[in-house]
Amino acid sequence: AQYTRPSNVSNIDVSTNTTAATLSWQNFDDASPTYSYCLLIEKAGNSSNATQVVTDIGITDATVTELIPGSSYTVEIFAQVGDGIKSLEPGRKSFCTDPASMASFDCEVVPKEPALVLKWTCPPGANAGFELEVSSGAWNNATHLESCSSENGTEYRTEVTYLNFSTSYNISITTVSCGKMAAPTRNTCTTGITDPPPPDGSPNITSVSHNSVKVKFSGFEASHGPIKAYAVILTTGEAGHPSADVLKYTYEDFKKGASDTYVTYLIRTEEKGRSQSLSEVLKYEIDVGNESTTLGYYNGKLEPLGSYRACVAGFTNITFHPQNKGLIDGAESYVSFSRYSDAVSLPQDVAAAHHHHHH
C-alpha cells in the first residue's frame, strides 16, 4: 500500500510526577487514526541513553515511567504509518520531572548554643537546592540551602543559628529542581539550654535567731531554659564571686573547717507542681538552720555571733555526682550564681549567755 508521509505532531502536553510523564499530542491529518507514534525520551546531557516508546495505532498519549526525579528531559514524537514512513520532523518538547521531597530530617541541639543542626540524606534524583523555613511565633526566617547528590548516601547537615534557647521551632524544607517545588517536609525542633542568665540582684538575708536566718530571693529568668533547681549557699568568708566548685561543700565540710562556704539547702522547682513561664518570676523564702536535709545537703544550725552572707545558684540542668550520693556535680551542671548578699551578724545565744552568767 502507498502512504503519504504523515504531517508533524503538534500541541504536545506533558503532565509529570517524580518518576513518570504522561504525554499527549495531536495530529490533524484525516488519516491520523491509522498512525502510530514513536517517542524518543532523552535525559538532558545523556543522548546515548534514550528511551523509545511506540504507541498502538490511533493512540495519541503515552506514559513514560522510570524517570529520575527533578530531571530535565526532551521528548521527540514522530508520526508513523505503514512500513515506518515517518513525519519529516518530530514534535519536540522539553519537560522536567517533579523533584522528590526529602523523606525526613533530624534536628540536633548544639550544647550550650542557641542553634540547631539539621541532618538529612539527599532525596532521590536531581535537585537545584532547597528552601529552608524556620519559624516560632511571629518570628520567621527563610533561606536557601545548596544542592546535594543522592548517589553515595552521604548525610548532609546545616546549622541554624541565632535562635533562642529552649524554644520550639517549626522547620520546613522544600526540594527545588527545574523551577519546580516538591511537597515540603516538616519537623518541630526545640533548641537546647545553657547556664541561666545571672540575676542582677542578690538574696536578702535576715537574722531570725542566734542560729538561723531567713533567705529571700527571686527566681532566675528562664530565657536560657527552665530553671530546674536552686541551691542556697552560705559563706563566712570573703564574698568573692562563687564558682561551681563550691557546690560540692556541705555543712559537715564547713563544721570540719574544710571550707568557709557550703550548700545549705536545695530546691527542686518541679516539686512546686507548676511550670514557670518565661516572664513569671517566683519568690522564694528559705529558713536556713532548721536542721532539714535536702538530698546530700544538711541545713544545720548556724553559729551564734557568726557573720554570714548568702548566695543563690540557679540550674537549668542539675547533675549529681555518681559516687557522692546527693551532691551536685558543678562541672556537669548548667548553673549560674547571684552575687553574695550583704553580711548579717547573728546575735549571741541569750539562753547560753544567761546560763554562763549564773555559773
Partner: antibody, heavy 117, light 107 residues
Framework: EVKLVESGGGLVQPGGSLKLSCAAS????????MAWVRQAPTKGLEWVAY????????YYRDSVKGRFTISRDNAKSTLYLQMDSLRSEDTATYYC??????????WGQGTLVTVSS | DIQMTQTPHSLSASLGETVSIECLAS??????LAWYQQKPGKSPQLLIS???PLHDGVPSRFSGSGSGTQYSLKIRNMQPEDEGVYYC?????????FGAGTKLELK
C-alpha cells in the same frame, strides 16, 4: 501548563485600598513559594512581597511594610495582596509569580493599579 | 540592601552577532542570580536561574556565567525574537533586587 491570572487592579485614590488576587492552575500551588513583583509605567521591576509554602511566613520590601499584606488560600490555589494606605508611587502593573530559590519562574499577565486623585 | 548594576543600558546587534550583558552585585550572591527577558506589553520571562541553568524551552544560544559578585548573560547568533529588555536579579537576600535593565535592539 502553569497558569497565573491576576485580577483586582484598578483606579484608586491616595490613601485608599485594593485587594489583588492571583488564581493559579497547572501546578501544586500549596508546594510553592509565591511573590508579587511590580513594574511602574516605563520603569524596571521591583519585588514587593513573598510568602512561603508550608508555614506561610511573609516578607515585604520596606516601602510597603505595614501597608501591604500578602496571603494565600491553598484550598483555592489563590494568592492575594491586600494594599492599604495606597500612595501615588504604588502605581504599577502587579505580577504574581512562583519563586523557588529566589528566582521568579512563572509570571502572570499582570494587573494595573493606578493611584491618583 | 544588595544593589544590582547592569551594563550596558542599551545595545544594538546585527543578526547572527554575539552579545553580552553584565551584572555586578554590591556583595556576593552565591550564584543566586536570574536573567529575564521582557518584550513590550508582556510579562517578563525567566531565561536563566542560579547563574547558569537554562529554563525550560529557552534556546541554547542563551547562556549565563559568573560567580561571587560578577555575572553575565551571553546571546550567541542574535535573532529578531531576541529583541527586548533584559533584567538580572539577585535572589540571595531580601529584599530581592533587579538590575535597571538592558534594552537589546536589532540593527
Amino acid at each position: 501548563e502553569v497558569k497565573l491570572v491576576e485580577s483586582g487592579g484598578g483606579l484608586v485614590q491616595p490613601g485608599g485600598s485594593l485587594k489583588l488576587s492571583c488564581a493559579a492552575s497547572g501546578f501544586t500551588f500549596s508546594n510553592y513559594y509565591m511573590a508579587w513583583v511590580r513594574q511602574a509605567p516605563t520603569k524596571g521591576l521591583e519585588w514587593v512581597a513573598y510568602i512561603t509554602n508550608s508555614l506561610g511566613s511573609a516578607y515585604y520590601r520596606d516601602s510597603v511594610k505595614g501597608r501591604f499584606t500578602i496571603s494565600r488560600d491553598n484550598a483555592k490555589s489563590t494568592l492575594y495582596l491586600q494594599m492599604d494606605s495606597l500612595r501615588s508611587e504604588d502605581t504599577a502593573t502587579y505580577y504574581c509569580s512562583t519563586v523557588p530559590l529566589g528566582a521568579f519562574v512563572y509570571w502572570g499577565q499582570g494587573t494595573l493599579v493606578t493611584v491618583s486623585s | 540592601d544588595i544593589q544590582m548594576t547592569q551594563t550596558p543600558h542599551s545595545l544594538s546587534a546585527s543578526l547572527g552577532e554575539t552579545v553580552s550583558i553584565e551584572c555586578l552585585a554590591s556583595e556576593g550572591i552565591s550564584n543566586y542570580l536570574a536573567w529575564y527577558q521582557q518584550k513590550p506589553g508582556k510579562s517578563p520571562q525567566l531565561l536563566i536561574s542560579h547563574a547558569n541553568p537554562l529554563h525550560d524551552g529557552v534556546p541554547s544560544r542563551f547562556s549565563g556565567s559568573g560567580s561571587g559578585t560578577q555575572y553575565s548573560l551571553k546571546i550567541r547568533n542574535m535573532q529578531p525574537e531576541d529583541e527586548g529588555v533584559y533584567y538580572c536579579q539577585q535572589g540571595y537576600k531580601f529584599p530581592y533586587s533587579f538590575g535597571a535593565g538592558t534594552k537589546l535592539e536589532l540593527k
